[in-house]
């Protein structure tokens, strides 16, 4: 028998520096998570005690923090490789800074493999672009060899930038012959790496023939053997095993997300190359593990050019941004709807003749607008002030939902209404009349949103029974303040980008902004 | 460093068969797949098949499949590869190569076989 | 089977001339490529791995280049050691095929 140690990270985010346990910015640095210099340490105490180990990486390594906006992807490449990451397959945020943005910071910098078997170049890219990354590789480790496949969710172009030259295949569709040809290369022992889901890594356990483990991504999900450490709830047990069609009992496992913890899986293998036993527990990166010093000092030269960069003018507003609780807790407030705007904007993405854009729709808590910004500072704008409007870390992310579930979360948005609770929800793309005369989960009496499959957006009415994609802050998918009527009746979840992020791109897109109240919220029979 | 030691030169009759050898030594001979390809004037240089000695595993080209057959003995460090019902067809230099999943990246110096009557 | 298609099958040059060969996959290949010399009676030997690797001890001179489909072999200011053949090969999946050679000869 052989063992392995599997270990793996995914949907980091840019989470380069420690984090608090809730992954936004480290506060009380004795109580602060994960972060590479932590990491490191992990990972080479790790390699020195057991012979056969593998660090993968399983996408999403970009966009999160100030550090992608900054460093755009470099900063991934001199990290990782400073770690010695053994592979690392690609995942839709790769992608975000268009296929430009991938090629020349990561792709040329990575001293690692970079793998997806399910992206096919095609057009002027296919030279551009092949041979930087992979759909396998061959892995020497220890006496023996392990292949690595990966796959990326073919989801990507509604999610991400990755052009019109690039064809995102079906997963399975897609691994099966490289997985075919690493058989026919002898290689026995065969890793599917990949960032499409959870749910899709239990298909590849199922259907893919010669997949022996699959590590996966996307879906930020966490899986635990015994009591969790920390606050993440386990969505089953580590590894989760599948049993696959032909029989064989194949591990899938995953790792929560944000560097917090560093997956460890240890697998046994017959001489055939089939699994005879698998074990491990994802290891919680907490202070008790030191920041490795030489990393530390690395990522603290880094930084420097972080904190002169929240200080440089992204743009300009020639008017008021009214983002003040009293505002956008009762109210349409222009920071809300910058903020919504910002969101289309981030997702525009003409992959369907039929479609203007495959979405029109956001929404967004009042409470979590934390700041106004005064236009009489020469009208400037900087990170700074909008990690004021915007300092929860948050990202804004893509879902679908019944129009009926849309209706709940508007009856939700006013039903304590004049409180000044955050649920109170900013719009782009709809048009909501309230009545407040109404007793509480009626209250809605107009509800238009903007139409996606038309050449000319108008406004109509909702359907209940349609389905629709919305952009939301991940609080809300998450069904913070109250909105568990999303969390419960969501039919997909796609995570998004940062959003400070979107609004300071926008901004910088735009130059100079002058978002105003323009009627998307309205009121009935007087009653405001 | 790796160095492939192959057998010497063969002259056999058409119909025959013939065993070769290859010698590995300088590296663990149970960690890289061995390759054997056939030179000719005329078809140039032709993949035959590779075997894993790890455990065995071998794949061929299905232009060789019944042609040639590909095993090793650990306990040697040795690759055989065996060619049966030979024809004048068979005649050409042998070669055993380390496969290190990125290139063949050693060779033996070839085993000549001659098939004639 | 994926076909390799290897030109010029020969080359005449002198010492201290570039030369450039060139080898064309039938589909896709990334970068599952390698370039190989062979001396007359002699082994093949690896010259670039991944397309654009130089092999342990291979001159800088040597320098491979391409992915996909379209890959090339580049000699600057030739030696005399360096006349002999030139085979291409690909080794995405089996059956590995070679390119069928090009000569190169001094003029």
């Known amino acids: 028998a052989w063992e392995l140690t599997i270990l793996h990270t995914n949907d980091v985010h840019s989470r380069l520096e420690q984090t608090s346990e809730d992954s936004s910015k480290c506060v009380n640095a004795s109580r602060c998570m994960g972060g590479v210099a932590r990491l490191f340490t992990k990972v080479q105490q790790i390699r020195r005690a057991e012979p056969n180990v593998l660090l993968l990486d399983a996408g999403d390594q970009y966009q999160g923090t100030i550090w992608f906006t900054v460093y755009k992807g470099a900063e991934v490449a001199h990290f990782m490789n400073a770690l010695r990451y053994d592979a690392m397959a690609l995942g839709n945020h790769e992608f975000d800074n268009g296929v430009e943005g991938l090629i020349e910071p990561l792709l040329k910098e990575a001293k690692f493999p970079i793998l997806s078997a399910n992206i096919k170049a095609k057009g002027p890219l296919a030279s551009q672009i092949s041979g930087l990354y992979l759909p396998y590789k061959v892995l020497p480790v220890g006496d023996e060899v392990v292949g690595i496949v990966g796959y990326t969710s073919k989801e990507t172009p509604f999610l991400s930038n990755p052009g019109t030259n690039l064809v995102f295949e079906d997963e399975i569709t897609a691994l099966q012959p490289e997985v075919d040809k690493l058989k026919t290369l002898n290689v026995n022992k065969i890793i599917a790496l990949g960032h499409s889901g959870f749910e899709m890594d239990k298909l590849i356990a199922q259907k893919v023939r010669g997949v022996d483990v699959v590590v996966g991504g996307h879906s930020n999900t966490f899986l635990y053997t015994g009591n969790p450490p920390s606050k993440e709830v386990p969505a089953g047990k580590y590894p989760f095993i599948v049993t696959s069609d032909d029989g064989r009992k194949v591990p899938v496992v995953q790792a929560y997300a944000f560097g917090k913890y560093l997956g460890y899986l240890k697998i046994e293998f017959d001489e055939r190359g089939n699994v005879i036993s698998s074990h491990g527990n994802p290891i919680l990166l907490n202070s008790s593990i030191p920041e490795d010093p030489s990393i530390k000092a690395d990522i603290n030269k880094w930084r420097i050019k972080l904190d002169n960069y929240s200080t440089q003018e992204l743009g300009k507003t020639i008017v008021y941004l009214d983002g003040s609780s009293q505002s956008c807790r009762f109210r349409e407030c222009n920071m809300g709807n910058l903020i919504c705007d910002a969101m289309i904007n981030n997702n525009l993405r003409h992959t369907d003749e039929m479609f203007w854009n495959h979405v029109s729709m956001c929404i967004l808590n009042g409470g979590g607008i934390r700041s106004p910004i005064d236009e009489r500072n020469n009208g400037t704008i900087t990170w700074e002030n909008l990690a004021a409007v915007l300092p929860f870390g948050g990202t804004f992310d893509l879902v679908q939902l019944k129009g009926s579930t849309l209706k709940k979360a508007f009856e939700h948005s006013v039903h304590r209404y004049g409180q000044s609770t955050g649920e109170f929800l900013q719009v782009g793309g709809i048009h909501v009349v309230y009545d407040l005369s109404r007793k509480p989960g009626d209250r809605v009496v107009k509800l238009d949103v903007l139409c996606t499959k038309c050449r000319v957006p108008s406004y109509d009415p909702l359907k209940m029974d349609e389905v629709y994609k919305v952009i939301l802050p991940n609080f809300l998918a998450n069904g913070g303040d109250g909105f568990q009527m999303i969390k419960d009746e969501l039919l997909r979840h796609d995570s998004g980008d940062q959003d400070i992020n979107v609004v300071s791109t926008y901004i910088s897109k735009m130059k100079v902004i002058y978002p105003a109240v323009e009627g998307r919220i309205k009121f009935s029979t007087g009653s405001h | 460093q790796a160095y492939l030691q192959q057998s010497g030169a063969e002259l056999v009759r058409p119909g025959a068969s013939v065993k070769m050898s290859c010698k590995a030594s300088?590296?663990?001979?149970?960690?890289?797949?061995m390759h054997w390809v056939k030179q000719t004037p005329r078809q140039g240089l032709e993949w035959i098949g590779a075997?894993?000695?790890?455990?065995?595993?071998?794949s061929y080209n299905q232009k060789f499949k019944g042609k040639a057959t590909l095993t090793v003995d650990k306990s040697s460090s040795t690759a055989y590869m065996q060619l049966s019902s030979l024809t004048s067809e068979d005649s050409a230099v042998y070669f055993c190569?380390?496969?290190?999943?990125?290139?063949?990246?050693?060779w033996g110096q070839g085993t000549s076989v001659t098939v004639s009557s | 089977d994926i076909q390799m298609t290897q030109s010029p099958a020969s080359l005449s040059a002198s010492v201290g001339e570039t030369v450039t060969i060139t080898c064309r996959a039938s589909?896709?290949?990334?970068?599952?490529f390698a370039w190989y010399q062979q001396k007359q009676g002699k082994s093949p030997q690896l010259l670039v791995y991944n397309a654009k690797t130089l092999a342990e001890g291979v001159p800088s001179r040597f320098s491979g280049s391409g992915s996909g489909t379209q890959f090339s072999l580049k000699i600057n200011s030739l030696q005399p050691e360096d006349f002999g053949s030139y085979y291409c090969?690909?080794?995405?999946?089996?059956?590995?095929?070679f390119g069928s050679g090009t000569k190169l000869e001094i003029k």
């Open positions: 090969q690909h080794h995405y999946g089996t059956p590995f095929t």
């Open positions: 300088g590296y663990t001979f149970t960690s890289y797949n």
């Open positions: 190569a380390r496969y290190d999943y990125d290139a063949m990246d050693y």
């Open positions: 075997i894993y000695p790890g455990n065995g595993d071998t």
């Open positions: 589909e896709n290949i990334y970068s599952y």
